[in-house]
Interface confidence: medium
Amino acid sequence: AGVFELQIHSFGPGPGPGAPRSPCSARGPCRLFFRVCLKPGLSEEAAESPCALGAALSARGPVYTEQPEAPAPDLPLPNGLLQVPFRDAWPGTFSLIIETWREELGDQIGGPAWSLLARVTRRRRLAAGGPWARDIQRAGAWELRFSYRARCELPAVGTACTRLCRPRSAPSRCGPGLRPCAPLEDECEAPPVCRAGCSLEHGFCEQPGECRCLEGWTGPLCMVPVSTSSCLGLRGPSSTTTGCLVPGPGPCDGNPCANGGSCSETPGSFECTCPRGFYGLRCEVSGVTCADGPCFNGGLCVGGADPDSAYICHCPPGFQGSNCEKRVDRCSLQPCRNGGLCLDLGHALRCRCRAGFAGPRCEHDLDDCAGRACANGGTCVEGGGAHRCSCALGFGGRNCRERADPCAARPCAHGGRCYAHFSGLVCACAPGYMGARCEFPVHPDGVSALPAAPPGLRPGDPQRAGVIAVIVVVVIAIVAGIVVLVISRKKRMAKYEKAEIKEMGEMHRELNA
């Protein structure tokens, strides 16, 4: 068992033209954090293979706000080491993947937005218990400086943390009744005791009493951060006086730049100009490819046609970002108008409209009588931004959806008796009254108060049959009118629903675009 430790020293724009000024987008401040992933072996890993040796996530760094016209500084980083504990033997050969993530803190819909800024992959051989290894890696326009090591945790020792040792004070034999002891070495290799007060975080020692500083720190106890103008300046020369470790004399001797990179000397160091598709201090790392598994959430990785972009991720529905790392909360786009509730069904969005609205986005206001507000042949009456349904006979309620008892409202006047009928109601009038609702009294002189009635019409006259016939014809005309209304309304609804389905499809295309 043991721990892999990673110390990030700096992250910032790499050298050369076109370097980004800021890790933040135009939307406002952001902060960085890192994810480290360890995979065993040096072989090409399957794109989505897990971090079998372990993974760790750093804390969020301090908030960074770009200062207009100021030179891009080193970016504020999270404090502390990233530690990845491993339970079994240290494999010696491994793939180290370091991701730099940006958390945007501006006015984001759905809270902070995360996006992958840079991803470096390093295939390495490393013995446990060895000194810190230092590295500089480039990922696109960004440059990352870091150190790492693997150390065993007692009682494990050795380059693979497989040998066990017994502390000096431990008894040499197992107690009675216990299983045989695991093979133990006689003594633990006690780690060297560093100089008293040497920073646990920024210092280390390989010999007792010394205190060697990690890159970026200086001073006798490694407590003093190196100023960015010296060795940590992203474009500035390295300096041995600051506690930074640099290559020896003749830095370009034997051309340390791999993969066809050309070497140029800088004061006390060297710089490789790498060909397209390679980066790193010595051009030893090829650009991120599909073999590095850069696409998250089931994104499909294809090699980029442009040599500067080694891969492209095709994201599945619901995800976006250059690495498909962002989940699209499609409902956060508030596609439903007029207070509709949004359902993200995965394959599609659905809006549940509030009463009074319809359409795929609840954009149709039924309250202005433009839609299908009144059911069962009811007619819509507008009024002050709201609507009212004037319902056909036999129906009631706000939208004429409720079957009504036409006699419930006692429509027959002057004691007339009401009879419900398929087309509405019929009133049987009390003596002395007449009309569809028994509303007209018959005068004592025998003339009714029926307006526009022929003179001399009396209840007992044979002409009364003619009046009844007229009423029957009117009722039939009303029924026919309702039938025509319903048929035309059905046609209109079918047309409306087609438009709704078409608009729904357009909305999905728009949201998935």
Epitope: Q334, C336, R337, N338, G339, L341, L343, R352, R354, A355, G356, F357, D365, D367, G384, G385, A386
Partner: antibody
Framework: QVQLQQPGAELVRPGTSVKLSCKAS????????MHWVKQRPGQGLEWIGV????????NYNQEFKGKATLTVDTSSSTAYMQLSSLTSEDSAVYYC????????????WGQGTSVTVSS | DVQITQSPSYLAASPGETITINCRAS??????LAWYQERPGKTNKLLIY???TLQSGIPSRFRGSGSGTDFTLTISSLEPEDFAMYYC?????????FGGGTKLEIK
């Protein structure tokens, strides 16, 4: 008549959670959506979210996603709002308000619950 | 989000007078603006919705007008019980947003 009953006050410690209730009466609970609104002392109103009691589908103001969780218990005609990881910023009066079924958003309001976050 | 700017934030008037309160939306909200009254010890009361529709039971001295981005609440012949806090709110698109409020006090 329509009534929305809310407890008067809650005193809670920072970092903890609180579950506010809103008991509805005088109407069919599942037929009307329920809104929640926040009002900090001396400040205006902020809409938190709305829930459909018929199936618990909710829409949240993104500002309150992760902070507020809306639920209902239809058997007792009660709407709930749980506020988590409380800080002093969450000290406020929280109202529940019934959604009108026509186009008016909130036609009946509760009296509000005053939440004080203090150690 | 749709921003709602309400003005004035404070207003003093006398009973019997007519006052107006304005709300402006940062983008068009069609006709979907509501007005509420907040009085101490009472539950908030919906006065107007959809810009100009009077909620049932609200006296006709309350009148709403406007559409698009500019809306007005007019209270004519002020009664003593009208002195209260008034809020406008857009109900066109989530998240629903409120104006900052207008405190109407007796002069």
């Amino acid at each position: 008549q329509v009534q929305l009953q809310q407890p008067g006050a809650e005193l809670v410690r920072p970092g903890t959670s609180v579950k506010l209730s809103c008991k509805a009466s005088g109407y069919t609970f599942t037929s009307y959506w329920m809104h929640w609104v926040k009002q900090r002392p001396g400040q205006g109103l902020e809409w938190i979210g709305v829930i459909d009691p018929s199936d618990s589908l909710a829409n949240y103001n993104q500002e309150f996603k992760g902070k507020a969780t809306l639920t209902v218990d239809t058997s007792s005609s009660t709407a709930y709002m749980q506020l988590s990881s409380l800080t002093s910023e969450d000290s406020a009066v929280y109202y529940c308000a019934r959604d009108s079924t026509v186009v008016a958003p909130m036609d009946y309001w509760g009296q509000g619950t005053s939440v004080t976050v203090s150690s | 989000d749709v921003q709602i700017t309400q003005s004035p934030s404070y207003l003093a008037a006398s009973p019997g007078e007519t006052i107006t309160i304005n709300c402006r939306a940062s983008t068009s909200i069609s006709k979907y603006l509501a007005w509420y009254q907040e009085r101490p010890g009472k539950t908030n009361k919906l006065l107007i919705y959809s810009g100009s529709t009077l909620q049932s039971g609200i006296p006709s001295r309350f009148r709403g007008s406007g559409s698009g981005t500019d809306f007005t609440l007019t209270i004519s012949s002020l009664e003593p019980e009208d002195f209260a806090m008034y809020y406008c709110q857009q109900h066109h698109v989530y998240p629903y947003t409120f104006g900052g409020g207008t405190k109407l006090e007796i002069k």
